[in-house]
């Protein structure tokens, strides 16, 4: 019961986490800036992985997509890749974990198969969560680096004078959503891995023995039936009668109409 609860909870937590990772990836508020020192209008700029938006004090908002791939910073491309990999792995993990849930019966799937699937999905959730956390952290680091690099330096170019204005950047809501979502996916994955241990069936401490009648006239030795149970004193699976008690390893490969398993 505890295993089912752990597995179910792990699945739900991971599901919420992956939904959060998808939401964070789609959000525009990865970085936000207030550009109030302007004589025309107060401007609020916010940027995501896919587009940059400007909102004015009048309420007007304009968003422009990053249509070029070549002009974008390598770090931004890396963050996009990490988030997408996280989503893909998480989605596959969710698909696998649905079939692995103990409360869902699919045909005659054994517990060992469910345990393996639970472990697989758990690992996928862990990697997915780590990808999201890494992606968000790389973006946050990029913001901090940009802030210190853009401290009011001026230079003159072909088009006149360019002044880099120092801004009070802030981490956008998407960063916090991403961090929390990545953490939840990671926790969900760990829970699935823990549940996997409880799902794995206990190993049997005896070897299964199969019996084959080699012919029509079989001479049983005394005590043969007692030994045939697979228990008792005959622990090494030695042949007690000529009828041919064999261990699984010794079974003949050719079929016979008198074979009993």
């Amino acid at each position: 019961m505890a295993v089912t609860a752990c597995q179910g909870l792990g699945f739900v937590v991971s599901l919420i986490g992956i939904a959060g990772i998808i939401a964070a990836t789609c959000m525009d508020q990865w970085s936000t800036q207030d550009l109030y020192n302007n004589p025309v209008t107060a401007v609020f700029n916010y940027q995501g992985l896919w587009r940059s938006c400007v909102r004015e004090s009048s309420g007007f908002t304009e968003c422009r997509g990053y249509f070029t791939l070549l002009g974008l910073p390598a770090m931004l491309q890396a963050v996009r890749a990490l988030m997408i990999v996280g989503i893909v792995l998480g989605a596959i993990g969710l698909l696998v974990s649905i079939f692995a849930l103990k409360c869902i019966r699919i045909g005659s799937m054994e517990d060992s198969a469910k345990a393996n699937m639970t472990l697989t999905s758990g690992i996928m959730f862990i990697v997915s969560g780590l990808c999201a956390i890494a992606g968000v952290s790389v973006f946050a680091n990029m913001l901090v680096t940009n802030f210190w690099m853009s401290t009011a330096n001026m230079y003159t170019g072909m088009g006149g004078m360019v002044q880099t204005v120092q801004t009070r950047y802030t981490f956008g809501a998407a960063l916090f959503v991403g961090w929390v979502a990545g953490g939840l996916t990671l926790i969900g994955g760990v829970m699935m891995c823990i549940a996997c241990r409880g799902l794995a069936p206990e190993e049997t401490n005896y070897k299964a023995v199969s019996y084959h009648a080699s012919g029509h006239s079989v001479a049983y030795k005394p005590g043969g039936f007692k030994a045939s149970t697979g228990f008792g004193s005959n622990t090494k699976n030695k042949k007690i009668y000529d009828g041919g008690a064999r261990t699984e390893d010794e079974v003949q490969s050719y079929p016979s109409k008198h074979d009993y398993v």
Epitope: L35, Q47, F60, E62, R64, Y66
Partner: nanobody, 120 residues
């Protein structure tokens, strides 16, 4: 890099008209605000007019009612229509744009200036 290309300046008689234009080019995300400033000889640089992406405008007191600012967002270009020009409008007119240049950074870019001379 962001470049500004200004054009339209020249010599005009009092009461005449001129149209200045300024086009921004280069790699950037957005241009929230585009505008014009001017600097007459021996005077400080002052705001002539500014316009936001949404069309919010702001004019300097000395040009209200005579000058009109407009912009083409698709072409990243700002225009300044100057009517009823006076000799005191003689100055170097500078294009100024606020550019969102990258993730977590923005630039204030100034053009090289175009000379407007109003005289008989």
């Amino acid at each position: 890099q962001v470049q500004l290309q200004e054009s339209g300046g020249g010599l005009v008689q009092p009461g005449g008209s001129l149209r200045l234009s300024c086009a921004a080019s280069g790699t950037f995300f957005n241009i929230p605000v585009m505008g014009w400033y001017r600097q007459a000889p021996g005077k400080q640089r002052e705001l002539v007019a500014g316009i936001s992406t949404g069309g919010t405008t702001n004019y300097g007191d000395s040009v209200k009612g005579r000058f009109t600012i407009s912009r083409d967002n698709a072409k990243n270009t700002v225009y300044l229509q100057m009517n009823s020009l006076k000799p005191e409008d003689t100055a170097v007119y500078y294009c100024n744009v606020l550019v969102i240049s990258g993730i977590g950074s923005h630039l204030e870019v100034w053009g090289q200036g175009t000379l407007v001379t109003v005289s008989e």
